[in-house]
């Protein structure tokens, strides 16, 4: 999607977590006919490798070509493998499928580092463990690449599902999303519970563990506990919102609040890491290290370069302060926090010379186009993504990994002024002089 | 620098009425937020109520709702809070402070206030 390296993110094994489970709430909205309840058939249909993305099965073609496709809430194009390449076990046969539509149109996509570029089509798809619906969709057939398929990680394609404003080559290219809804009955809405597994897993683990679940139409109460919190959905191209506050261990980082909005702040499922503009990240930083003092890290671990690892089952939790993010409520002057914990901000990852350690990565970074909810924000909720309404809720996960003292959280309401000033109006520039 | 200065604490059965006053020093117009936080023995200052004095919106922390009411007189540049059906846990040292206008502004927590006036006690004997 939009810049850099966006390695996608990690999953985990499936089911609540051991020790603390929230009580539900009972002030909770009333139920909406057709949009909330059970969806036992999509719960804990996605998986994924630590830091290489959470990927659902779906079909593409006549007869249907199985692939799996990487969940990516941060770009708008449905595009998947189709052609050989060395990272890739399978990929997309359009010759083969008699429902193949060439659009005659190409497609290119540059990142920072990496790129894709592909022939446009339609074809049917659907997705085995999601609604029992096909549509006809748009795909990129992606013909080359660089530094976009991870090897090893088990997809050959994404699923870019936000809004037609940032899909490529324009936005008149109907993003998926938007085909399933005007062809079927489907709600407009989905909702994603990414399970982060707390520790590394290899090759074998992710193929028989459960990443999470991917509800397409709707909201599954199993999936979380106490009551979902809404922001309001700021503008629909990237899953756009507002940030008014951050605090670490309940410590205020006393910014301007645009500055943490600046130049946008997206949740975004491709994303791994939580980050944040310079001059937040700094802070951040400096404020985390303060509060876990009692230890000494490398320059290099703060920077997401180094490792830093413990003896098996020796990690020191409680020396890292909890993050929190205000967000805007959908109450006039009425916020909510989202409280994540050192789980699932240190990603844990496996160590080359040791598997005797627990090794972990700091999974906070820096960004230079706004605030990225990745995974390791995401990890901690239960994420609605309720286009209908134009909001994003939030719930805390029953599958985040968490330990007897906290839990991450989602509180609130407080109140607070003034927060629509807390966003930045990125200028209106010609689109042809802008570079991706 | 705007300077604050509080006034009206004393003693008071509970039940009773007291009106607290804070002068600023020049006044604190639309851009500004005015509050009263109390700090009562061995505990943290917390917010009771502020006004957005631009528009004369109050907030008011759920402990005194109904019962405590902010208010400004803008010719006197003054603040007034304006205490009714007092309970001993309302003893403490009211402090009257303000802060510029500025976007996600919590309004009941005194880390967001620039300006502070000294205090004054407010003592509630059952």
């Known amino acids: 999607t939009q810049h850099g390296i966006r390695l996608p993110l990690r999953s985990g094994l499936g089911g609540a977590p051991l020790g603390l489970r929230l009580p539900r709430e009972t002030d909770e909205e009333p139920e909406e006919p057709g949009r909330r309840g059970s969806f036992v058939e999509m719960v804990d249909n996605l998986r994924g490798k630590s830091g290489q993305g959470y990927y659902v099965e779906m079909t593409v073609g006549s007869p249907p070509q199985t692939l799996n496709i990487l969940v990516d809430t941060g770009s708008s194009n449905f595009a998947v493998g189709a052609a050989p390449h060395p990272f890739l076990h399978r990929y997309y046969q359009r010759q083969l499928s008699s429902t193949y539509r060439d659009l005659r149109k190409g497609v290119y996509v540059p990142y920072t580092q990496g790129k894709w570029e592909g022939e446009l089509g339609t074809d049917l798809v659907s997705i085995p463990h999601g609604p029992n619906v096909t549509v006809r969709a748009n795909i990129a057939a992606i013909t080359e690449s660089d530094k976009f398929f991870i090897n090893g990680s088990n997809w050959e394609g994404i699923l870019g599902l936000a809004y037609a404003e940032i899909a490529r080559p324009d936005d008149s290219l109907e993003p998926f999303f938007d085909s399933l809804v005007k062809q079927t009955h489907v709600p407009n809405l989905f909702s994603l519970q990414l399970c982060g597994a707390g520790f590394p897993l290899n090759q074998s683990e992710v193929l028989a563990s459960v990443g999470g679940s991917m509800i397409i139409g709707g909201i599954d109460h199993s999936l979380y506990t106490g009551s979902l919190w809404y922001t309001p959905i700021r503008r629909e191209w990237y899953y756009e919102v507002i940030i008014v506050r951050v605090e670490i261990n309940g410590q205020d980082l006393k910014m301007d609040c645009k500055e943490y909005n600046y130049d946008k702040s997206i949740v975004d499922s491709g994303t791994t890491n939580l980050r944040l503009p310079k001059k937040v990240f700094e802070a951040a930083v400096k404020s985390i290290k303060a509060a876990s003092s009692t230890e000494k890290f490398p320059d290099g671990f703060w920077l997401g370069e180094q490792l830093v690892c413990w003896q098996a089952g020796t990690t020191p939790w409680n020396i890292f302060p909890v993050i929190s993010l205000y967000l805007m409520g959908e109450v006039t002057n009425q916020s909510f926090r989202i409280t994540i914990l050192p789980q699932q901000y240190l990603r844990p990852v496996e160590d080359v010379a040791t598997s005797q350690d627990d090794c972990y990565k700091f999974a906070i970074s820096q960004s230079s186009t706004g605030t990225v909810m990745g995974a390791v924000i995401m990890e901690g909720f239960y994420v609605v993504f309720d286009r209908a309404r134009k909001r994003i809720g939030f719930a805390v996960s029953a599958c985040h990994v968490h330990d007897e003292f906290r839990t991450a959280a989602v509180e609130g309401p407080f109140v607070t002024l003034d927060m629509e000033d807390c966003g930045y109006n990125i200028p209106q520039t010609d689109e042809s002089t802008l570079m991706t | 620098q705007v300077q604050l200065q509080e006034s009206g604490g004393g003693s008071v059965q509970a039940g009773g009425s007291l009106r607290l006053s804070c002068a600023a020093s020049?006044?604190?117009?639309?851009?500004?937020?005015m509050a009263w936080f109390r700090q009562a023995p061995g505990k943290e200052r917390g917010g009771v109520a502020t006004l957005a004095s631009r528009y004369d919106t109050t907030y008011y922390a759920d402990s005194v709702k109904g019962r405590f009411t902010i208010s400004q007189d803008r010719a006197k540049n003054t603040v007034y809070l304006q205490m009714n059906s007092l309970k001993p846990e309302d003893t403490g040292i009211y402090y009257c402070a303000a802060s510029p206008r500025r976007p996600g502004f919590f309004p009941l927590d005194p880390s967001q206030y620039n300006y502070w006036g000294q205090g004054t006690q407010v003592t509630v004997s059952s």
């Open positions: 020049e006044y604190t117009d639309s851009t500004y937020y």
